[in-house]
Interface confidence: low
């Protein structure tokens, strides 16, 4: 299709080479009353359609992207051929940041449902850069966590060194919705609830004396508790001795709950006590059984092939570790009688 | 404070609007929500608003309720009214803390 | 969705006694929890928030606490005041599809 008529915008992604980053285009189709480029000829009054080409957000879930190759070659369908990027209803989700994103991309609504439709496509000119090392070294992270229950706020990255008076204009989005009331570089949150996590997007244009553009940024915010003040404590094993058949193959579980820490670093290992010895055991993976707001509940097993006489002789014993301390529980096997 | 208007009886199927008023404090900036109570019955949470004008309502409320926001006030629209909606209507500022509310509006479904 | 299980829906204490409300969430709320307080022919009004925040005005005999996924309010040295009914109300995951009344079913509360 002929993508001359399409509405053109320009914008800019400075990524930083420090932290992994997301980022998004929305397919910002113009709505009927706006538009004058979506109807082919302009209409006279009288010749308006009943029903307008695009209804708003209702009509923008279903929409086609391409980019254009700079060589000049046709159209390229986004989903076939790249695969660092997914689409999602109106929004193109880039998964992984690099200058090979720069481009144009097309959208325009996969149905067409009037001939006044033909034109209606936006195109974006989309430039990345690597963030210079010139630029503030101490810019808001595209990951940001809020304290549920108290109150805290969300930063743009792009401006989080200049001061609210010098900041521009800032159009904030959630979730691809857009937040009206909030124009600075910086979403105050009097008290954090869980939906306020969720994928911010932060535009501000930039001018030069030949063109502007639209400076964007995607912040991933995450609603969390307070990092937990206790050490871990483990459910299973409860019992200090486990009654067992000689010769047969046994499975012990240690479970374990490690409160919320915002830098996560669990550690659940098994070791045996044989006199004044002891080792670790090569175990299978810890995998997290349950997973909610506050805790974490993780399980690791010991296996052994066949319980011998030597193990009746031992301690086997889970240890469990986070940042505040350690906690163990040890389990003396014991022959199974009758 | 809060004030609920527009409750009454109604014939069912026919929509009612209520409206939820501040004085004292400015509505923009806050989370609203809509609570009703059926005579003699215990309190059911319809859904809220947030600053930014989006609702989001209680799973039984999708559909049947609709809720809307001007700066100076917070509406409630009931789209068919059955019998089981005649209830008190309350608005409440915040939803995690529902510090202030309004005294309610009754609005009674009746043949 | 949630369902929150209060219990019991009525009971009865002596001035100057203690009462004891339980709220039971069918899965972790975080502390998303808000204790009301209703009396005849008014709204509620907010006794505890975030599960155990005492509310504005509120007086000290309101305790509240939380553990997992129960919830308690406690009221001591009661006062006929205080002959009213009592609701929890669970905030936690409101934005969801498949929330649904975010309240406990009340708890009756009469004072002798």
């Known amino acids: 299709f002929n993508i001359s008529g399409c509405s053109t915008k320009k914008l800019l992604w400075t990524y930083s080479t420090r932290s992994e980053e997301e980022f998004v285009l929305f397919c910002d189709l113009p709505e009927p009353q706006k538009s004058h480029f979506c109807h082919r000829n302009r209409l006279s009054p009288k010749q308006v359609p009943e029903h307008l080409p695009f209804m708003g957000s209702n009509d923008l879930s279903d929409v086609q992207w391409y980019q254009q190759p700079s060589n000049g070659d046709p159209l390229e369908d986004i989903r076939k051929s790249y695969p660092h990027i997914i689409q999602d209803k109106c929004t193109l989700h880039f998964l992984t940041p690099g200058v090979n994103n720069s481009g144009s991309y097309i959208c325009r609504p996969k149905m067409i449902k009037s001939p006044y439709d033909v034109a209606c496509c936006v195109k974006m000119i989309l430039e990345v850069k690597p963030q210079t090392n010139a630029s503030c070294e101490y810019s808001a992270s595209h990951k940001q966590d809020l304290l549920l229950g108290s109150t805290g706020s969300i930063s743009c990255p792009s401006l989080s060194c200049q001061s609210d008076a010098q900041s521009p204009a800032v159009t904030w989005y959630k979730n691809g919705k857009l937040l009206s009331v909030e124009r600075s570089n910086r979403i105050v949150v009097d008290e954090v609830y869980d939906y306020h996590q969720g994928t911010y997007v932060c535009d501000y244009t930039q001018s030069d004396t030949v063109s502007s553009w639209t400076v964007r940024a995607v912040v991933q915010v995450r609603t969390i508790v307070g990092d937990t003040k206790l050490k871990p404590d483990i459910l299973d094993p409860v019992e200090d001795t486990l009654e067992v058949e000689l010769g047969k193959p046994l499975t012990i579980s240690c479970k374990a709950r490690f409160g919320f820490e915002r830098v996560f670093n669990p550690v659940i290992k098994w070791y045996i006590k044989d006199s004044d010895l002891e080792w670790e055991v090569s175990v299978p993976e810890a995998k997290s059984i349950k997973s909610t707001l506050k805790d974490e509940i993780i399980e690791r097993n010991i296996i052994l092939e066949k319980v011998t006489q030597r193990d009746l002789r031992r301690k086997f014993v889970c240890f469990v570790q986070n940042s505040i301390g350690n906690t163990t529980q040890s389990v003396q096997l014991k022959e199974k009688r009758g | 404070s809060l004030e609920e208007s527009g409750g009454r009886l109604v014939t069912p199927g026919t929509p009612l609007t209520l409206t939820c008023t501040a004085s004292?404090?400015?509505?923009?900036?806050?989370?609203m929500t809509w609570v009703r109570q059926a005579p003699g019955e215990g309190l059911e949470y319809i859904g809220f608003i947030d600053p930014y004008s989006s609702p989001y309502y209680a799973s039984w409320a999708k559909g049947r309720f609709t809720i809307s926001r001007t700066s100076t006030t917070v509406d409630l629209k009931i789209s068919s009214p059955t019998a089981e909606d005649t209830a008190t209507y309350f608005c409440?500022?915040?939803?995690?803390?529902?510090?202030?509310w309004g005294p309610g509006t009754l609005v009674t479904v009746s043949l | 969705d949630v369902v929150m299980t209060q219990t019991p829906a009525s009971v009865e204490a002596a001035v100057g006694g203690t009462v004891t409300i339980k709220c039971q969430a069918s899965q972790s709320i975080s502390d998303y929890l808000s204790w009301y307080q209703q009396k005849p022919g008014q709204p509620p009004k907010l006794l505890i928030y975030r599960a155990s925040n005492l509310a504005s005005g509120v007086p000290s005999r309101f305790k509240a606490s939380e553990s997992g996924t129960e919830f308690t309010l406690t009221i001591s040295d009661l006062e006929c005041a205080d002959a009213a009914t009592y609701y929890c109300q669970c905030t936690f995951g409101a934005t969801n599809d498949d929330y649904g009344n975010a309240f406990g079913g009340g708890t009756e509360v009469v004072v002798k």
């Open positions: 004292g404090f400015s509505l923009n900036n806050y989370y």
């Open positions: 409440a500022r915040g939803v995690a803390v529902g510090d202030i």
